[in-house]
Interface confidence: low
């Protein structure tokens, strides 16, 4: 498909001249950021961004690649080096430590320097590193965590927890020996390490004692509470704050977000991770966009400003399943949340960053025609005389042999939300990838986001922009917090 | 491997604070660029950049990812959308038209708007678009093309040619009907469309009549001249310029580059593409770094400045073969050329851009330990109880089944320069990928390189920075060319 207007060189020359004009007008703001938002697309490498752009565009009846994601509109871009101290290809724990705390750690550890060792409880103490969210709270800002995964998952946990094992969601996941040594599960740290004003996502089961039925799935024992210590962490959290509210469904969330008496809000909408956007029951569970909006309504009441972490956490899960349909529809919802946040905040006082913790071994090739489905087939046949999809994985569970050969695929099969794209190597779960990821920035001090940087730079830019420790002498005007 | 110094949070905090300091000091230059250099890594997607960084670092006895490529040091980064008008995933012809001429074209066409149709000679006339190199020449600058492919290949051809078929290297490749309609082969256009001061790369055989033995391979008929029109294009080119010199080996190149009487230089070092860096006979063929240096020595004599195109063109070829070793060693030589150019020019007056035309379905995953070989195996086994490499391809010639199963691989096999990484889909040649690629920028007006842009933006930034058409009223001081 060749759009007639694109045949004319003037179309491209005019468009580029306009882009140049916009570039020339960009003026680095010399002010501090009152508010900080970091949007984290878990596993959202550059190949995912491009494929999601095309899909989002095609959902709006465009050809695809010429359209803009909300994140594409951010004026500054950098590349972020995601390796962990011990691995070329990292996990979401070590990376969360980097972009939220400003220090690189080891694979599968969270909120700890690399002096800590995975799974060795006795290496925790003394190696804790402090997140920007924690520092924002100390500076009098309101803070929030929003995610489509469980709120105790690796990425959000980087904002508040310190653990040598990212899998220690509740005390039932922590070995007795580690519990005896004083290592706390992540759910416990969520309510006790610091005062978080807004907590929205999944993860109900880790907050309640074993045997507590889940309110949404009361007959499913596997969805009920998991805690061995008998604690009801939600109850403990509610008891800490006069204006605290706990909700577990969309209706309650929307009510609470509009209630001026609510100062602290915890919404846990699934026992574990939230459902994929394509499976979400919109009467029961809020979307990431809705959770983001609710969080912003509450947090923006604070005249000193806020820090908000928003994660599209299941982009990663779709990729691990080699189901690109899931990964890309999650990316679109993540981008919708970015767009909504942009409407509810001002780039005059809010530094917004969009990035990924790492990428995936996910590729988009095969020379498909413009306007063809991102989930479709490449033109022509492979060497084995069979069709193949434009989306593929390097490794993952999509690998299958049928009668000792690669199976054929049709356009209708490949377009299914359940279809697993093929891979070169068979794994139970497709792996992360180690290439640099993009950082998109808008707002005060966004111009500092440039070039190729270590992932740790992200936390430091946020801290500097809002004059948080260790950059309290940031020399930016107006100084953060002067509006109260 | 965990470096002891990296266990200390101070290591990361200090490093990030320094990076912040550097970011704060960045001052957009308000001057015009006297010189323009575009470094084009053919097929150099972000995954290639990261993997090459690790390899280059490890060749210097470092762990790898913490090191810097020369391009990593460029202060500004943007993302470039590479699709062609008719394809989501483009080729090197349509993309060359975009980044060199500022207009998007159709797959496999060069220097033509999308009104032209692939292989249809009669759609050429009237649809030609003019490259920045051509405009630089008009403005009195010296211009040059340096590549590791044949100089008539798609990417360099974007600087000087207009053709509906990128494969029309010599007249022997052009159908008689198209020749009768007046469509010229690329080699002819190389010497006749415009005055190019420096031409360095491969492509001898397209310049000489059929039956002309090649000077390096006189006994190999297949390497000799291919032209049917009986023309000796080198002779014709030499006759155009008093100070023109033709060379075909490294010794002659080095001599010519230091000879003040040489005003125009054509060096063609192989009959077709130049050899991969790992196969290069360093007594006969220059490296890309050496060709770049030679070009800069000649071009920098012009007080009005220069335009130089430098292509690491065989990164792409290594990937098409699914031989990551070749792709990554080519990328390192490309980066070495960037580094050398940086030493020979000043960012005060030279705008340098580094980018790729497109990416490849190449991924780097599997959670390898830091410091482990980029060509090595992932820890653990795949679901078929066999080893697998961290580098893999979505599709390509590395696909293989042995007794109806994926073959095992050892570290020594995967480390071989000839090893083809496995892929999900069997193809004769691995395909390009459609995700955005990075643009790195340094020098006057480099700050305009920001955000997510159409690939066409690159040509416009260069034209604007040097006050070339259509931006002659660029309002930058000092205006380009005022030093003569």
């Amino acid at each position: 498909i060749i759009p007639v207007e694109e045949e004319n060189p003037d179309f491209w020359n005019r468009q580029a001249a306009e882009a140049l004009g916009a570039a020339k007008k960009l003026q680095p703001a010399q002010t501090a950021a009152k508010n900080l938002i970091i949007f984290l697309g878990d596993g959202m490498g550059v190949s995912t961004v491009t494929a999601a752009r095309i899909l989002k565009g095609q959902k709006k009846d465009k050809l695809g690649p010429e359209t803009f994601l909300a994140m594409d509109r951010f004026p500054y871009v950098a590349l972020s080096k995601t390796y962990s101290v011990d691995k070329h290809v990292p996990d979401s724990g070590a990376t969360a430590t980097a972009y939220l705390c400003g220090v690189k750690g080891n694979f599968q550890t969270i909120g700890l320097s690399a002096a800590a060792r995975f799974n060795q409880c006795n290496t925790t103490r003394g190696n804790e590193v402090i997140s920007v969210m924690n520092r924002a709270k100390k500076a009098g800002k309101s803070v929030g965590v929003v995610t489509t995964t469980r709120v105790q998952h690796a990425s959000p946990a980087g904002a508040y927890a310190h653990t040598v094992n990212r899998n220690w969601y509740s005390d039932a996941d922590v070995p007795a020996s580690a519990r005896q040594e004083g290592c706390q599960d992540i759910a416990t740290q969520l309510i006790s390490n610091m005062d978080i004003d807004v907590i929205l996502g999944g993860g109900r089961k880790y907050m309640f004692p074993m045997g507590t039925p889940d309110p949404e799935y009361p007959d499913d024992y596997s969805q009920g509470g998991t805690r061995l210590d008998g604690k009801n962490l939600v109850q403990e959290w509610l008891a800490k704050h006069q204006g605290a509210r706990y909700v577990w469904n969309r209706t309650e969330l929307l009510q609470a977000s509009l209630d001026p008496s609510v100062t602290h809000l915890m919404g846990l909408f699934e026992p574990g991770d939230m459902k994929y956007e394509i499976h979400r029951d919109s009467t029961l569970d809020p979307s990431l966009m809705e959770m983001t909006e609710a969080a912003l309504l509450l947090l923006s009441r604070n005249p000193r400003g806020f820090f908000l972490f928003v994660e599209g956490g299941r982009i990663d899960h779709g990729h691990h399943e080699s189901r690109a349909y899931r990964a890309l529809t999650e990316t679109i919802m993540f981008d919708d949340a970015i767009e909504r946040a942009g409407q509810l905040t001002s780039e005059e006082d809010t530094l917004s960053l969009v990035t990924a913790d790492h990428s995936h071994v996910f590729s988009f090739g095969g020379y498909p025609l413009r306007g063809s489905s991102i989930f479709g087939l490449a033109p022509g046949k492979a060497r084995d005389r069979k069709a193949y999809t434009v989306l593929l994985y390097g490794n993952g569970p999509g690998y299958v042999l049928k009668d000792g050969a690669r199976p054929d695929v049709t356009e209708s099969e490949s377009g299914s939300p359940e279809y697993r794209q093929q891979s070169a190597v068979p794994l139970d779960g497709e792996t992360h990838a180690g290439e640099d990821v993009a950082v998109f920035a808008r707002g005060p001090q966004a111009h500092l986001v440039h070039g190729v940087q270590e992932q740790t730079f992200i936390a430091h830019v946020m801290a500097f922009a809002a004059c948080l420790e260790p950059y309290t002498a940031c020399d930016l005007a107006p100084r953060a917090g002067t509006t109260d | 491997i965990i470096p002891v110094e990296e266990e200390n949070p101070d290591f990361w905090n200090r490093q990030a604070a320094e990076a912040l300091g550097a970011a704060k000091k960045l001052q957009p230059a308000q001057t015009a660029a006297k010189n323009l250099i575009i470094f084009l890594g053919d097929g150099m997607g972000v995954s290639t950049v990261t993997a090459a960084r690790i390899l280059k670092g490890q060749k210097k006895d470092k762990l790898g990812p913490e090191t810097f490529l020369a391009m990593d040091r460029f202060p500004y980064v943007a993302l470039s959308k590479t699709y062609s008008v008719d394809k989501h995933v483009p080729d090197s012809g349509a993309t060359a038209t975009a980044y060199l001429c500022g207009v998007k074209g159709n797959f496999q066409t060069i220097g033509l708007s999308a009104a032209a149709r692939f292989n249809q000679c009669n759609t050429t006339r009237g649809n030609e678009v003019i490259s920045v190199m051509n405009r630089a020449k008009k403005a009195g600058k010296s211009v040059g093309v340096v590549t590791t492919t044949r100089v008539q290949h798609a990417s360099p051809a974007g600087a000087y040619a207009h053709t509906v078929n990128r494969n029309w290297y010599s007249d022997a490749d052009v159908p008689a009907s198209a020749r009768q309609e007046g469509c010229q082969d690329i080699a002819t256009q190389l010497i006749s469309n415009m005055d190019i001061d420096v031409i360095l790369g491969g492509g001898r055989k397209y310049m000489f009549p059929m039956g002309t033995p090649d000077p390096e391979y006189p006994d190999d008929y297949s390497q000799g001249g291919t032209r049917l029109d009986g023309k000796n294009l080198v002779q014709e080119w030499l006759a155009k310029h008093q100070g023109a010199r033709y060379v075909w080996n490294r010794t002659e190149l080095l001599q010519a580059s230091l000879d003040p009487s040489v005003t125009h230089l054509m060096g063609l070092f192989e009959p077709g593409d130049m050899k991969y860096e790992i196969h290069r006979d360093s007594t006969l063929d220059p490296s890309l770094m050496e060709m770049t240096e030679a070009a800069l020595l000649l071009l920098s004599r012009n007080p009005r400045g220069f335009f130089l195109f430098v292509e690491g063109g065989r990164i792409d070829h290594g990937h098409h073969e699914s031989r990551a070793y070749r792709a990554l060693t080519e990328t390192i030589m490309f980066d070495d050329a960037i580094e050398r150019a940086g030493q020979l020019t000043s960012e005060e007056d030279t705008l340098s851009l580094v980018t790729a035309d497109h990416s490849h379905v190449f991924s780097f995953g599997g959670y390898p330990l830091r410091g482990s070989s980029i060509f090595g195996l992932a820890p653990g086994k795949a679901r078929d109880r066999k080893a697998y490499t961290v580098l893999l391809y979505g599709n390509g010639p590395g696909y293989v089944l042995k007794d109806g199963a994926r073959p095992d691989v050892t570290e020594s096999e995967s480390g071989s320069p000839e090893y083809r990484q496995q892929s999900a889909v069997p193809l004769d040649g691995e395909t390009h990928a459609g995700e955005d690629v990075a643009v790195f920028a340094r020098g006057p007006q480099a700050h305009l390189v920001h955000g997510v842009q159409e690939q066409t933006f690159i040509a416009h930034v260069m034209a604007f920075a040097a006050c070339l058409e259509p931006y002659t009223a660029c309002d930058l001081a000092p205006r380009a060319g005022t030093t003569d």
Partner: antibody, heavy 126, light 110 residues
């Protein structure tokens, strides 16, 4: 799993002959390369041609064999080798063999033949 | 490509070790696509080793292969009477026209 060649005969110089390779216990649609290799009396092995099973149409020939020899898949269990303009130099035992790999270029087939037929003798004499 | 093998015959004592070399005029594909076949009179060849050093199933571990690029060796240790045969190397190359077998090396067991 086995292979068996047939069609070997005594023919005069200049004649044509078709050899057949029949598979038992597997079929060619399982995507194997099937190759013909010959061995002149008292001499070494010489690769002739390969075909990729499964009606793919992919064939590869030794330079000397192209034009005079044609390899074809005639059914899911039979592959033939048509030989024309036979000379005394073509007198040999002809083997058909299956590649170890179900996916490899034929370029490598000679180095991966793990299932062979017993051979069939072609004699060229006037 | 031309594959040159150790000239025939090569003598080996029972229980001893024998090595046969194979030199290729150009590098085999992936530097390892070289195989060794054993052929006894009146029988078809039998694949012993593929990809330089990988033992085909059912082949005794007394047979081993080594080498890379253009130089390869087949080693038979603890030689048995049953090992008396002609051994051929065969190379796979990046172009099918270069596919070839070596001339063969006869091993005589005493």
């Amino acid at each position: 799993q086995s292979l068996e060649e047939s069609g070997g005969d005594l023919v005069k110089p200049g004649a044509s002959l078709t050899l057949t390779c029949t598979a038992s216990g597997f079929d060619f649609s399982s995507y194997y390369w099937i190759c013909w290799v010959r061995q002149a009396p008292g001499k070494g092995l010489e690769w002739i041609a390969c075909i990729y099973g499964g009606s793919s149409g992919s064939t590869y020939y030794a330079t000397w064999a192209k034009g005079r020899f044609t390899i074809s898949e005639t059914s899911s269990t039979t592959v033939t080798l048509q030989m024309t303009s036979l000379t005394a130099a073509d007198m040999a035992t002809y083997f058909c063999a299956r590649s170890l790999y179900t996916w490899r270029y034929a370029d490598y087939a000679a180095s991966t033949l793990n299932l062979w037929g017993p051979g069939t003798l072609v004699t060229v004499s006037s | 490509a031309v594959l040159t093998q150790t000239p025939s015959p090569v003598s080996a004592a029972v229980g001893g070790t024998v090595s046969i070399s194979c030199q290729s005029s150009q590098s085999v594909y992936n530097v390892n696509l070289l195989a060794w076949y054993q052929q006894k009179p009146g029988q078809p060849p039998k694949l012993l080793i593929y990809e330089t050093s990988k033992l085909e199933s059912g082949v005794p571990s007394r047979f081993s292969g080594s080498g890379s690029g253009t130089q390869f060796t087949l080693t038979i240790s603890d030689v048995q009477c049953d090992d008396a045969a002609t051994y051929y190397c065969a190379g796979g190359y990046s172009s099918s026209k270069d596919n070839s077998f070596g001339g063969g090396t006869e091993v005589v067991v005493k």
